[in-house]
Amino acid sequence: IWELKKDVYVVELDWYPDAPGEMVVLTCDTPEEDGITWTLDQSSEVLGSGKTLTIQVKEFGDAGQYTCHKGGEVLSHSLLLLHKKEDGIWSTDILKDQKEPKNKTFLRCEAKNYSGRFTCWWLTTISTDLTFSVKSSRGSSDPQGVTCGAATLSAERVRGDNKEYEYSVECQEDSACPAAEESLPIEVMVDAVHKLKYENYTSSFFIRDIIKPDPPKNLQLKPLKNSRQVEVSWEYPDTWSTPHSYFSLTFCVQVQGKSKREKKDRVFTDKTSATVICRKNASISVRAQDRYYSSSWSEWASVPCS
């Protein structure tokens, strides 16, 4: 058993039929010695008396809020949560496996630049009685500070008969050095509690590996005289690291017809302009990627040829 936060404890249980469970001793936080009784949740049934209560925790029915009382007055509470281990593996019932980029991916994280700021998100089908707490650090043995905000519900989607909920959190490395070579990964830890079930999820990454620039901005077309060609121009996104001479992007320019089946013309360039042929009813799209490190491409910025 360990303390998650004040008066909240996690009991780690091997979860199999007829498992013996864990013996837990609860101590009433009071100077009183006599006349103390214990109850669980809203029940008025007295579970025991005395300053300590010894219980065998085997299942969810044994978890919950234990309260010690004296003469009708509440003295203290202890909330017991369960963390299930099945076949040697901690349960992952609360979050959905996003399966990208690989199986057992519960947390996904992205950064728009090298500032040390990043966003992580996760999915669940659970809509109520759910709390998340996020901690992060650079390295684990001698951790350097990363500050995370509160997780918030960022999207709700319908998947068949069920809804799916996306939560996200923003974190910022306290002493980020954008130009430095990373040697220790960022660690992100999410504590998830649904009712009386505790689970934890972790992700480890280098900022350079989760970079995904915003799309290029101010995408414009300039027709060239006496030609079907146009000059496409754009700018670095505002959120990208500066100076651009050091934090450089490369770009992919694509001409796409109305039909998805039509052949796409693609041009790769390090410049912020390109000359392409604009077909009728086509659109021109541009996306960006770190020039020197193959992390994710940005989403497309698009304009119609017309």
Partner: antibody, heavy 116, light 108 residues
């Protein structure tokens, strides 16, 4: 205690509001549920309203009902009832432990008959 | 999400024992309650958290199970136990909520 009212005979398409009046506890502490039971059938949950006022509906509801509350009542509005909505409608109070809860205080029910 | 109750009807003698099963289509941990309903009356809570007896309910009623399989057992049957019994999952309103189809208990 909780007690439902407002059930009556209505023609199809006529909106109807059922009211659940509560006493002896505060709606700001408990989840409330509306459940219905067609004649000779089982229990079917319609929706719940949490202590903070958030509403959650069964997937089949699809905008046919809305739940709201005041400090002492919980309303179920039937937007455009059909004959399939003929049932006894129950209001019940949760235990206070959770939003998705079990229910330990039930009203006697109010009968809604939808017929032309 | 589905809660399947079996059997739909059962007949048993006074002082006998009845077992009703409730199966969830996905794990709901121990978030299951049982209700008794008599004709013309609202449901009455018997069991919550799969196995905890509600206030004032005789110990002849007991609940067990977790995950997807749950059981309500009524021992030492009395004529007053003739009723319909419903299980209810309260895991989450989006991801596992609702009532089983009911089991009618006839006491002879």
């Amino acid at each position: 205690s909780v007690e439902e009212s407002g059930g009556r005979l209505v023609t199809p398409g006529t909106p109807l509001t059922l009211t659940c009046a509560v006493s002896g506890f505060s709606l700001s502490d408990y989840t409330m549920i509306w459940v219905r039971q067609a004649p000779g059938e089982g229990l079917e949950w319609i929706g719940i309203i949490s202590s903070s006022g958030n509403t959650y509906y069964a997937t089949w509801v699809k905008g046919r009902f809305t739940i709201s509350k005041t400090s002492t009542t919980v309303d179920l509005k039937m937007i455009s009832p059909t004959t399939e909505d003929t049932a006894t409608y129950f209001c019940a109070r949760g235990s206070g432990a959770y939003i998705s809860d079990y229910f330990n205080v039930w009203g006697p029910g109010t009968l809604v008959t939808v017929s032309s | 999400f589905e809660l399947t109750q079996t059997p739909s009807s059962v007949e048993a003698a006074v002082e006998g024992t009845v077992t009703i099963k409730c199966q969830a289509s996905q794990s709901i941990d121990s978030w299951l309650s049982w209700y008794q309903q008599k004709p013309g009356q609202p449901p009455k809570l018997l069991i919550y958290a799969a196995s905890k007896l509600a206030t004032g309910v005789p110990s002849r009623f007991s609940g067990s199970g977790s995950g997807t399989q749950f059981t309500l057992t009524i021992g030492d049957l009395e004529c007053a136990d003739a009723a319909t019994y419903y299980c209810q999952s309260y895991y989450d309103v989006n991801a596992g909520y609702g009532f089983g189809g009911g089991t009618e208990v006839v006491v002879v």
